[in-house]
């Protein structure tokens, strides 16, 4: 055991304590007395840096006194009990409560012992992410928006995507004094390839255990992109019925499909069935250019396909013929 008087009494407290705006917080503060050391505490004091006087005092015979009695309370100190725990509870935290506080013990025979604690006033932000629906513009525009509302300190917003894009982040004061609303726009040149893809907004804040991830499904409005499939350049007389498909990608969805030829209406062997064109068996060679015209809310686009039905050797069974 160390001989009496070799150790010193020490005030123990965290260097920083976080608290939430409007909530209560406890500033912990304890007197650590080494074994064999004798100390008697006669007073506990809390003071704020930069302010004259003390905000809370617990006196061994007078009890507690507070600068703001409704907002402060000694958690454990009691008259007639040993004063070793100076922890102070603060109610209804305000932005202006953030700062440095001193917890002080008046001891005998050691004298005063104190420690400083930084009180950090936080506000947990509310986060939302939404798509910014765009059309093809040919230049960069905001395609997604992520908003972190009422944070203290301001939240950090980053974007994660394999599409590229650039963030544009701004801050404005929040609804509650001392809070900040952060808005981040994700900017890219819109293209049909981007439509339906996801980007992720990552919001980081001291009050979060882990970052919040918000996924945005991108929307690009564009006119139809059209192609015709189903023809393999290998159609012969005697072949069974065949089907061509008008493949259209668009946003919004296509509202109509119209089949025609460069010569005008469809010939009798071609029957339109919405996005599909049924080619019936023919008994003589054909060389026709088919047109599929697709319409959506943004306009109409078309694709052309020249189809040939050729005479082939009778041994082959791939031709178009009547059964």
């Amino acid at each position: 055991w160390p001989p009496p008087g070799t150790g010193d009494v020490v005030v123990q407290a965290p260097t920083q304590v976080p608290g939430f705006l409007g909530d209560s917080v406890t500033l912990p503060c304890y007197l650590q007395v080494p074994n064999m050391e004798v100390t008697h505490v006669s007073q506990l004091t809390w003071a704020r840096h930069g302010e004259s006087g003390s905000m809370a005092v617990f006196h061994q015979t007078q009890g507690p006194s507070y600068s703001e009695s409704k907002r402060l309370e000694f958690v454990a100190a009691r008259l007639g009990a040993e004063l070793r725990n100076a922890s102070l509870r603060m109610f209804g935290l305000r932005v202006e409560d953030e700062g440095n506080y001193t917890c002080l013990f008046v001891t005998f025979p050691q004298g005063s012992r104190s420690v400083d604690i930084w009180l950090r006033v936080l506000a947990k932000p509310q986060n939302t992410a939404e798509v910014q629906k765009v059309q093809l513009t040919g230049e960069p525009v905001p395609m997604a928006r992520c908003v972190s509302t009422g944070g203290r300190p301001p939240a950090q917003i980053t974007w994660h995507s394999d599409l590229g894009g650039m963030p544009n982040t701004s801050q404005v004061p929040g609804f509650l004094s001392g809070t900040v609303t952060v808005t981040s726009l994700w900017i890219l040149v819109p293209s049909s390839q981007v439509d339906g893809k996801n980007v992720t907004c990552k919001v980081e804040h001291e009050s979060f255990e882990k970052p919040q991830l918000l996924t945005v499904n991108l929307t690009v409005y564009y006119p139809p992109e059209v192609s015709i499939s189903g023809y393999d350049n290998n159609w012969y007389l005697g072949q069974n019925e065949a089907t061509l498909t008008c493949d259209a990608r668009s946003n919004p969805e296509p509202t109509g499909y119209n089949w025609s030829t460069t010569m005008g209406p469809l010939p009798p062997f071609a029957v339109a069935q919405g996005a599909q064109l049924l080619i019936r068996p023919v008994d003589k060679p054909i060389n026709t250019t088919l047109i599929c015209n697709v319409t959506n809310a943004l306009g109409a686009r078309q694709a052309e396909l020249t189809v040939q039905v050729k005479e082939g050797p009778p041994s082959e069974h791939s031709g178009i013929s009547r059964n």
Epitope: H40, T45, S54, V57, T61, L104, V106, P109, S112
Partner: antibody
Framework: EVQLQQSGAELVRPGASVKLSCKAL????????MHWVRQTPVHGLEWIGA????????AYNQKFKGKATLTADKSSSTAYMELSILTSEDSAVYYC????????WGQGTTLTVS | DIVMTQSPKFMSTSVGDRVSVTCKAS??????VVWYQQKSGQSPKALIY???YRYSGVPDRFTGSGSGTDFTLTISNVQSEDLAEYFC?????????FGAGTKLELK
Amino acid sequence: EVQLQQSGAELVRPGASVKLSCKALGYTFTDHEMHWVRQTPVHGLEWIGAIHPGSGVTAYNQKFKGKATLTADKSSSTAYMELSILTSEDSAVYYCTPLWLRRDWGQGTTLTVS
Amino acid sequence: DIVMTQSPKFMSTSVGDRVSVTCKASQNVATNVVWYQQKSGQSPKALIYSASYRYSGVPDRFTGSGSGTDFTLTISNVQSEDLAEYFCQQYNSYPLTFGAGTKLELK
């Protein structure tokens, strides 16, 4: 009501010793330290030292180490201060008091060294 | 040792006046300052602890303020029973030290 009853005035010869007493009434004697303070026209109020009757722990002003010895008797709730090798410089009114812990001081003991 | 420099030494006042006594510590003593009143022929009596808190029973015309090194005792609406000597004392570190006193006299 808290009362601190100090022993009567003393007239002593230089070189002698004297033991002053202070009886505490109206509060738990072992709860907090008893301080001793002296007052003279020249030096005003001077802190001599203190004892915590509960633990026996003492603290002294370096100026009075070897001059003053503080003790306490828990059974009678009495604090004592013995002053040794007295000189005329030690002539003063001596007070016992819990200082900032309570409002009260003893009535004082006048010590004359002559 | 911490030196407590008190001023003024003497102060003349009239009943109903407001007076202030100051005390300056030679180093930071936080708010660990007590103010005493000593009437002629009596022992001192504590008025204010921790720089600004009145002991129970002390009239509210006595107000203490300050922290660190500069402290003030203010008596508003001075009464005849307030004519006395006032002392400050620091209890932040040992040895405890007192101011030299301020004597409040009637004009």
